[in-house]
């Protein structure tokens, strides 16, 4: 399999609303027309697929309607946003990039972004 370098930040802290964003950048060895991006979550040595999208260069990423991910692309960068995160979702989120067309097929896997999610403290009851 032809390997490709993928870079992503080491650590990201989710917002109080459970939203985390990070950039996934890949070093395309040729001109890519169609790219597939997959976000994987690794926790306790188990890897699960969080979301995936295939996009044509210059077009928007289209995740499934019920996906917790959204994203935009610009050149060889993909800006990924994961929503609805809770403390239990803390883990290593790995960006996997595949150059689907034109051939040859290339695969690149990042080292992962550790996303920390802290559940907000419930608001104390007010006297007002």
């Amino acid at each position: 399999c032809k390997a490709m370098h993928v870079a992503q930040p080491a650590v990201v802290l989710a917002s109080s609303r459970g939203i985390a964003s990070f950039v996934c950048e890949y070093a395309s060895p040729g001109k890519a027309t169609e790219v597939r991006v997959t976000v994987l979550r690794q926790a306790d040595s188990q890897v699960t697929e969080v979301c995936a999208a295939t996009y044509m260069m210059g077009n928007e990423l289209t995740f499934l309607d019920d996906s917790i991910c959204t994203g935009t692309s610009s050149g060889n960068q993909v800006n990924l946003t994961i929503q609805g995160l809770r403390a239990m979702d803390t883990g290593l989120y790995i960006c996997k990039v595949e150059l689907m067309y034109p051939p040859p097929y290339y695969l690149g896997i990042g080292n992962g972004t550790q996303i920390y999610v802290i559940d907000p403290e419930p608001c104390p009851d007010s006297d007002f």
């Epitope: 399999c1 032809k2 027309t33 169609e34 295939t54 044509m56 689907m100 067309y101 034109p102 051939p103 040859p104 097929y105 290339y106």
Partner: antibody, heavy 116, light 110 residues
Framework: QVQLVQSGAEVKKPGSSVKVSCKAS????????ISWVRQAPGQGLEWMGG????????KYAQKFQDRVTITADESTSTAYMELSSLRSDDTAAYYC?????????WGQGTMVTVSS | QSALTQPRSVSGSPGQSVTISCTGT?????????VSWYQQHPGKAPKLIIY???KRPSGVSDRFSGSKSGNTASLRISGLQAQDEADYYC??????????FGSGTEVTVL
Amino acid sequence: QVQLVQSGAEVKKPGSSVKVSCKASGGTFSTYPISWVRQAPGQGLEWMGGIIPILGTPKYAQKFQDRVTITADESTSTAYMELSSLRSDDTAAYYCAQDNGAFDTWGQGTMVTVSS
Amino acid sequence: QSALTQPRSVSGSPGQSVTISCTGTSSDVGGSDYVSWYQQHPGKAPKLIIYEVSKRPSGVSDRFSGSKSGNTASLRISGLQAQDEADYYCCSYAGSSTFVFGSGTEVTVL
């Protein structure tokens, strides 16, 4: 440049299945898609589906989705196309072709005749 | 995934030029840089003559040229010769690892 050699002609009964092979040699197999294209006598070319061997996940034309299975064996550099529930109108030449941004290499074709 | 539209046949005298059109949609021809053309003689496998809209593989005569405007691709054969008599097919990448071929055009050299 890769060469593609297909299995020989087949005669099949309606309702049965046929499996055609396509062996690659002399080039890169794993990372270049292999497509299957058929041509009924006196008719045009029809894309059936394809596979990137290293991925192993095929894509099919809607028309053939329910009846075709495309696989690839990296260890032998061979792609396969199986068509089930054969009908007389499946009588055709079946070609494999390697995709390098275009189908630049074709197999010699396999004639499949469906007749009772 | 309906076939791209090509004229059923075109003809010309030796030395003349003929043009074959290939009409699709914005989802295939109009939106793809990967439009190719194939020549097929009776009983033979197709042969690539144009790729990526207008590029010629090595060994293919420069009498063959390709172009695209909107949802229509075109193949031009100039200086028509007897050996150009064959069927010609366009093909476009249609996204998500799928392709669509044209209906085919028979070229006759008068």
